[in-house]
C-alpha cells in the first residue's frame, strides 16, 4: 500500500522537517527558518510559535517540532500548552480585574494563584479553633472540649474548605 501510495502521491515521501514543494515539481524542500513540520507528507510548514512578552521560550522551535513557551517570572501558565499567562499574586491575595487584592476577612489563599477561600468552620465538625486563620493560612481546628478528657486523641486535621462559587464581575 505504501508503495502504491507513493506512486500516486510523491508528497508522501517527504519526511518531517520538510514540505512538498509544488513550485519545484513536488520535491521535498526543507522547512524555511522559523517554521516546522512535525509529520511527513506535509504540503506546507507551520509557523513556529513565538514566545515573547509575557511568554518565554521553554523549548526552541526545530524543523520538526514547534517551540514551547512558559511564562516570564511574575506570571504563571494557564491552559493547554501554556496558551495564556496570568499574573502571580502574593499569598493572602487573589487576582481580580483590578489586580491583586488582599483576601477579605474570613478567607485565605496560601498560594500565588487562585482565589481566596473561606476559613474552615471548625464548629461544623464539633471542634474548636486551635489556631486562628490569617489571610495566608486556614484556621487549625482542635479537639472539642469533650475530646480533652484523659486518653483522648490528639489534634485532628482541619476539614477541607469548600470551594465557593465565583461571583460574576
Amino acid at each position: 500500500f505504501e508503495r502504491t501510495r507513493s506512486l500516486q502521491d510523491p508528497c508522501s515521501n517527504c519526511p518531517a522537517g520538510t514540505f512538498c514543494d509544488n513550485n519545484r515539481n513536488q520535491i521535498c524542500s526543507p522547512c524555511p527558518p522559523n517554521s516546522f513540520s512535525s509529520a511527513g507528507g506535509q504540503r506546507t510548514c507551520d509557523i513556529c510559535r513565538q514566545c515573547k512578552g509575557v511568554f518565554r521560550t521553554r523549548k526552541e522551535c526545530s524543523s520538526t517540532s514547534n517551540a514551547e513557551c512558559d511564562c516570564t517570572p511574575g506570571f504563571h501558565c494557564l491552559g493547554a500548552g501554556c496558551s495564556m499567562c496570568e499574573q502571580d499574586c502574593k499569598q493572602g491575595q487573589e487576582l481580580t480585574k483590578k489586580g491583586c487584592k488582599d483576601c477579605c476577612f474570613g478567607t485565605f489563599n496560601d498560594q500565588k494563584r487562585g482565589i481566596c477561600r473561606p476559613w474552615t468552620n471548625c464548629s461544623l465538625d464539633g471542634k474548636s479553633v486551635l489556631v486562628n486563620g490569617t489571610k495566608e493560612r486556614d484556621v487549625v481546628c482542635g479537639p472539642s472540649p469533650a475530646d480533652l478528657s484523659p486518653g483522648a486523641s490528639s489534634v485532628t486535621p482541619p476539614a477541607p474548605a469548600r470551594e465557593p462559587g465565583h461571583s460574576p464581575q
Epitope: G53, S83, M84, C85, T96, K97, S167, Q169
Partner: nanobody
Framework: QVQLVESGGGLVQPGGSLRLSCAAT?????NYWMNWVRQAPGKGLEW???????????YYVDSVKGRFTISRDNAKNSLFLQMNSLRAEDTAVYYC????????????????SGQGTTVTVSS
C-alpha cells in the same frame, strides 16, 4: 497573523512624560480587554494597567495610579499608555498584552503580547 507592536519608548528625565502606543493586527481589538505589563532590569514581570473593551473600566497597579493613563482607539486598533511624572523606578521594558473577551471569574490570562518598548528614566 495576530500581532501586537509597541512603540514610543525612549530616554526621559525624571518628571518627564512619554506616550506608548500598541498597534494590533490580525484581530479585532474591540473584542478584548487589553493590558500593559512591564519588566524592570533584573526583575519579574509586573502588571501595570488594563482597560475593558469600550474603555469604560480602567485599573492600575498602585505605584502608577494618578501618573499613568491607559486608553484605546478601537477604530484604529490601537492601545496607549500616557506616562507622566516618570520616576527612575519606571525604567523597564513595557509590553502590551491581550486579555480575555470578558473578565469574569475564570481567569485573567493574557494570550498575546508584543516585543516590548524600552523606557529609561534617568537624568
Amino acid at each position: 497573523q495576530v500581532q501586537l507592536v509597541e512603540s514610543g519608548g525612549g530616554l526621559v528625565q525624571p518628571g518627564g512624560s512619554l506616550r506608548l502606543s500598541c498597534a494590533a493586527t490580525g484581530f479585532t481589538l474591540s473584542n478584548y480587554w487589553m493590558n500593559w505589563v512591564r519588566q524592570a532590569p533584573g526583575k519579574g514581570l509586573e502588571w501595570v494597567a488594563n482597560i475593558n473593551q469600550d474603555g469604560s473600566e480602567k485599573y492600575y497597579v498602585d505605584s502608577v495610579k494618578g501618573r499613568f493613563t491607559i486608553s484605546r482607539d478601537n477604530a484604529k486598533n490601537s492601545l496607549f499608555l500616557q506616562m507622566n511624572s516618570l520616576r527612575a523606578e519606571d525604567t523597564a521594558v513595557y509590553y502590551c498584552a491581550r486579555g480575555g473577551t470578558g473578565y469574569g471569574s475564570d481567569h485573567y490570562g493574557m494570550d498575546v503580547s508584543g516585543q516590548g518598548t524600552t523606557v529609561t528614566v534617568s537624568s
